[in-house]
Structures are given as C-alpha cells and as structure tokens.
C-alpha cells in the first residue's frame, strides 16, 4: 500500500529505525540522545538561514521478542518487521534513518519502492555499495579495499619500497559487523583486493594464524586482521614473530591509538594499525560522555544523518523544490555538509569519505606514531613520516615473500 | 616532581671540546626523548638535536652536525652534548628539554633545564 | 626548512590590556586536524617555559589569560589581561618538521 510520508506544509519527520540488532551494542538511548542531539542543531540552523519549520524524529522500535539475537545475524527480518510497521502506520518520514546491519539493509533496499532516502550507520558489506537512494555515513569496505590495494601497490616511500602482491587473511568468524564485512570483502573471489593480489589465503584458525608467524615456508610475510590490539594479543599473546612480518591491524573505529599517554604494548611492534583520523570535538558533546572510544562513531553518524537531512532541507527549501521526489531522495550525495565535527564528504554513491590513518609503534618511545593518511576521496596516499623508527630491518617495510628482490 | 639538572658553566679555549651533561629526575627516562636548544645572546633559540634514550635514536639540525654529539645513559637517566672544535659562535647558554612525542608524529618541548653557559675565548 | 615570522618583534603594552603576538608558518604547519604550533615564554635568565602545546592547549598550571589560537600558517598568542608578571620574550615553535623557532617577540610593560 502506499504510505504518504509526513514531509510538507513546514512539518518534516525523521523516521529513525531503533533496530535490537545492530552494527554496534549501543544502548538505543544513546543513539535516541544523539538523534535529539542533531536535531537541536538542524532546527538552529534552519532557524537561522530564516526558514521557519519543524522537523521532529520518530522513533520506529521492533518488539524484540522475535529478533532478540542483539547482533546483525537476525536482523534481516527485523527490518523488514519494522517497515510493515511503517506501512501499517500509513506513516513515513521524509527520510529512514537506520538500518546499520547489512543483511536488513539489503533485504530492506530489494524489497521496498525506495521513493525516499535511506541514511545509515553502518551496511559495511560490498552488497550495499552503488544504491541510488542508500547512504553510508561509517566507512564501508570497498573504501578500506581500495586503501589496501593502493598501500600494497606503492613502492616509492622511503619506507616501502616493495610492492606487495600477496597477503594472508585472519578471519575466524567470531568477528564485530564491521571486521565481519571488510574482511568478506577481501575474501570474496571477485572483489577488487582478490583480482589485484597475485596470492591471497584466508586463514580460519588461531593455530593456523600462529604456524604462519614463524613458518619458513609462508607465501607472504603480510597478515591483515580486523579488530583491537587486545584481540591480537589474544590470538598471538607474546609468541616470537619472524622478523618480516608485517601484521595489519584494521581497527577503524577506534581513537584510544589518539588519547594522551598511551603506550603500545610490545606485542604491537610488528604491526601497523589502520584506523580513522580521530574528531576534536566530541570528546566533550553531551552525547558520547558515556560512549566508549569505538563507540563514538555509531552515534557520531547518527547525529550526522540528521545534519545531514537537516543540509539537504535547506537546499531544497531555499529552491522552493518538493521533498517527497525522487530528485530528493537521489540527492545524498557527491557533497559535501557540515557534520557535528566538521566537514563531511559523500563521494558519488553516498559512501562517506574520510582520512584514514596508518600508524606504527616507534621504537623511541613504544608510542603509535603516523606512518602515513590516506583519502579515500582521491585514493591517494600521503606519508607523513618519511624516517620512521620502525622495528623493521633498515627502517623499511619488508617485501612480501620473503628472500624476494627489488621489484 | 619531572627536573632536569644540568652541568656548570664551561669556559674552554678555540678548538677545544666540551661535554655537557643533564640529568633527568621525576619520570621514566625512557619515555621521552632529549631535546638540546642553543641561545646567544640577543639572538633567539635554535633546536640543535633529539636523542632516544629507549632506543639511542638520534636526530640533529643539519647546522649542527658535526658540531655537536649527543648520548645518553640509561642507568644514570643522563643525557650528554658533546661540543667540539669550539669557536666563538658556539658561546651561549645550552638547554637541555624534555621531549614529548604525539601520534601524528611531532615534538613539543614541556620541562627545561635551567641551562649551561658556555664560553669560548683565548 | 619552515620559517616561522614573529610580529611584532617587541611590544609595549598597558597593564590590564590584551596583547596579541602572531605567528607566521611559510608553509601548513597542520596535519590530521592537529596543528604543530607550541608557544614558550622566556624570561631574563630563566629557561624557557612551555605555555600552549599544539596551538590552543593550554599547559597546565599556566593562567587562563593565556590564550592561543590559529590553523595552517597563521597562529596567535593572546595575553588578557596583561600583568607585570607577563614580561619576557615570547617563541612560537613548529613541529610539523625539522623544529624550527620563531624570532621572539618582546613584551614590555608601558
């Protein structure tokens, strides 16, 4: 049936999905105080550009009775739960924030006549890329696999002057939504990172991953994995590691590497860490006083989604153009707006760009240190440090297969 | 509390060496590196060179190299500058500085030793 | 090398006003949102002491009438109100690559 969306005569409604499973176990208060958190600013700002509206968040929660497993495994259904909810309500907003699993993501986007933008935190896997009316305000891996590609390929820093063409893959199916997808992504037999790497083994064991750190017989002496310095610990607690080893430690969401004084343990030494650059100012906000650091960018691209909406409003109003048009619900993309934190880009299919951030342990001072930032917008890499004290022989990166010369 | 104690004044003929010293008290020596910073008179302050103690690590201004050695001691949490073949233009107060790095790689200098005087004349 | 420009390079101000003192990179002094630019004050033979680290973070234990503030290449010291006390000579220090000081700026009282 066709529901009518609550979107004109100066009444614009958020519809905002409060899913039990989710990307991240985030409290929904805390994602309800982030969405209140934006919408105290979009009304400012649209108070002060002199249009004089209101816009209001509903927020949509599924029973949790039936989809209780409070992770993504069970969220496709979920989700759809939650729009015959809409339907039933013959209530939509002018935009659906949420889903962030991508199981409902994708389920949602196949089975709905999506005349309406969808925003969500989250939907990292490859099957959420290159929808018309979907945006993703948390980094999905197609861009992380475009780092990857662009990192094993460079070859002209003083400190990697090797390309790389294998890797192997720690993944052992006990990973969060996010490291669940990036590392499907670098699985996948057709994805960009399989078809540019010559050797790639996805290794599912923990004693497979340990063999390999010693074992004189590897294909590469490159590792990536997905999570925090603790789950690399656990995995390899303090075993020797060969001296070519580079371990990759895809850790995005994550600032704690940026807070004043911390120390890289001693297991981090042969391991560069690739996360996101950190915001300033939300140490401070109201909204993540309670969030952990990995936490913060969940409720972070909440907040955004609604500036989002709340940027592309004003646009449209000033144009004195109708928000319930397909026109709209193209619209969130290829810009840039003003998030809580700064600046945000959307590349052309609403993918959120960002500056990603390599780091490794110094040996002056056991401190993570840049390596080098890359930008997703431009696939482009910038190093920072030109002379790192790195662990590694000479200060460089080792090649990938060991014994294997100047390329 | 975090000091740094550095050596007395010098007084040393043209040509000759000197080894200053500044020794750390109040924190892991290992932790941070050690900054040295040039002063003359009526003149403002150059960075002169970092060294590591955790790692020996040692990092100088183009200017100085070959003027000045820097080291340091770990079971003393002392750190050296060793000036030699001295001219008049190395009369000045030398400072030694604790050095904090940050993860984007850069350095600030946040407790100072109350610095050495040196003096190069016939 | 960078070249940090201090102006003015002296400065005679009244008690109880503001002073500004600006410091100039030749080139950005900024990197991942972070801005390299740290202010010291020296004072008639003491060593120099460290006021704001990383442009607009004050050191602790260093009154609030010391303020600082900037990006890229253009950076300000501010001292309000100034105090008898806050006689000496000024440094801005970048860290972005080889540590390079600015001039100094001297700060009298009128």
């Known amino acids: 049936s066709q529901v009518s969306q609550n979107c004109h005569n100066g009444s614009y409604e958020i519809s905002v999905l409060m899913m039990g499973n989710s990307a991240f176990a985030e409290p929904l208060k805390n994602l309800e105080d982030a969405v209140n958190e934006g919408l105290e600013i979009v009304r400012g700002r649209l108070q002060n550009a002199g249009l004089n509206v209101t816009v209001n968040a509903t927020f949509m929660y599924s029973d949790g009775l039936i989809h209780n497993s409070g992770d993504c495994r069970s969220s496709t259904c979920e989700g759809l739960d939650l729009l015959r909810k809409i339907s039933n309500a013959q209530r939509m907003g002018c935009v659906l924030i949420g889903p962030s699993c991508t199981y409902s993501t994708f389920q949602m986007y196949l089975d709905t006549e999506l005349s309406y933008p969808m925003i969500s935190a989250g939907s990292f896997g490859l099957s959420c890329d290159y929808k018309e009316t979907l945006t993703r305000l948390m980094s999905p891996a197609r861009k992380l696999m475009y780092f990857l590609v662009n990192f094993w390929k460079t070859n002209d820093l003083p400190f990697k002057t090797y390309s790389w063409s294998t890797s192997y893959v720690y993944k052992n199916g006990t990973e969060t939504e996010d490291c669940f997808w990036y590392l499907n992504a670098l699985e996948a037999s057709v994805s960009y990172f399989s078809h540019e790497l010559g050797f790639k083994v996805v290794l599912r064991q923990d004693k497979e991953f340990q063999d390999i750190l010693m074992d004189h017989n590897r294909k590469s002496n490159v590792i990536i994995m997905c999570g925090g310095p603790e789950f690399l610990y656990k995995l390899k607690g303090d075993r020797a590691v060969a001296e070519d080893i580079v371990i990759i430690l895809v850790d995005l969401f994550n600032d704690q590497y940026f807070e004043d004084n911390v120390t890289a343990p001693d297991y981090m030494k042969n391991v560069l860490v690739l996360t996101l650059s950190p915001g300033n100012s939300l140490l401070n906000s109201s909204f993540s006083r309670n969030l952990s650091p990995t936490k913060r960018d969940f409720a972070l691209a909440y907040l955004n989604g609604i500036l989002l909406f709340g940027h592309m409003l004003k646009i449209f109003l000033e144009n004195g153009e109708n928000i319930t048009t397909p026109k709209f619900a193209h619209a969130f993309r290829n810009l840039t707006f003003e998030g809580y934190d700064g600046p945000v880009t959307l590349d052309d299919w609403g993918d959120v760009d960002s500056t990603m951030v390599l780091l490794y342990t110094s040996v002056d001072t056991k401190k993570y240190k840049v390596l080098l930032t890359y930008d997703t917008h431009v696939n482009k890499t910038y190093p920072v440090d030109m002379s790192p004290t790195f662990t590694w022989k000479n200060s460089k990166l080792p090649n990938d297969i060991t014994g294997r010369g100047p390329q | 509390q975090v000091q740094l104690q550095q050596s007395g004044a010098e007084l040393a003929r043209p040509g000759a060496s000197v080894k200053l010293s500044c020794k750390a008290s109040?924190?892991?020596?290992?932790?941070?590196?050690i900054t040295w910073v040039k002063r003359r008179t009526g003149q403002g302050l150059g960075w002169i060179g970092e060294i590591y103690p955790r790692s020996g690590n040692t990092y100088y201004n183009e200017k100085f190299k070959g003027k000045a050695t820097l080291t340091a001691d770990k079971s003393s949490s002392t750190a050296y500058m060793e000036l030699r073949s001295l001219t008049s233009e190395d009369s000045a107060v030398y400072f030694c500085?604790?050095?904090?790095?940050?993860?984007?790689?850069?350095?600030?200098?946040?407790?100072w030793g109350t610095g050495t005087t040196v003096t190069v004349s016939s | 090398d960078i070249v940090l420009t201090q102006s003015p390079a002296s400065l005679a101000m009244s008690l109880g006003k503001r002073a500004t003192i600006s410091c100039r990179a030749s080139?950005?002094?900024?990197?991942?949102?972070?801005?390299?630019i740290h202010w010291y004050q020296q004072k008639p033979g003491q060593p120099p002491k460290l006021l704001i680290h990383h442009a607009s973070n004050l050191e602790a234990g260093v009154p609030a009438r010391f303020s600082g503030s900037g990006s890229r290449t253009d950076f300000t010291l501010t001292i309000d109100p100034v105090e008898e006390d806050d006689v000496a000579i000024y440094y801005c220090?970048?860290?972005?690559?080889?540590?390079?000081f600015g001039g100094g700026t001297k700060l009298e009282i009128k």
């Open positions: 220090l970048q860290s972005r690559k080889i540590r390079t």
């Open positions: 500085a604790r050095a904090i790095t940050t993860v984007v790689g850069d350095w600030y200098f946040d407790v």
């Open positions: 109040g924190y892991t020596f290992t932790s941070y590196g």
């Open positions: 080139e950005s002094v900024s990197l991942i949102g972070t801005n390299l």
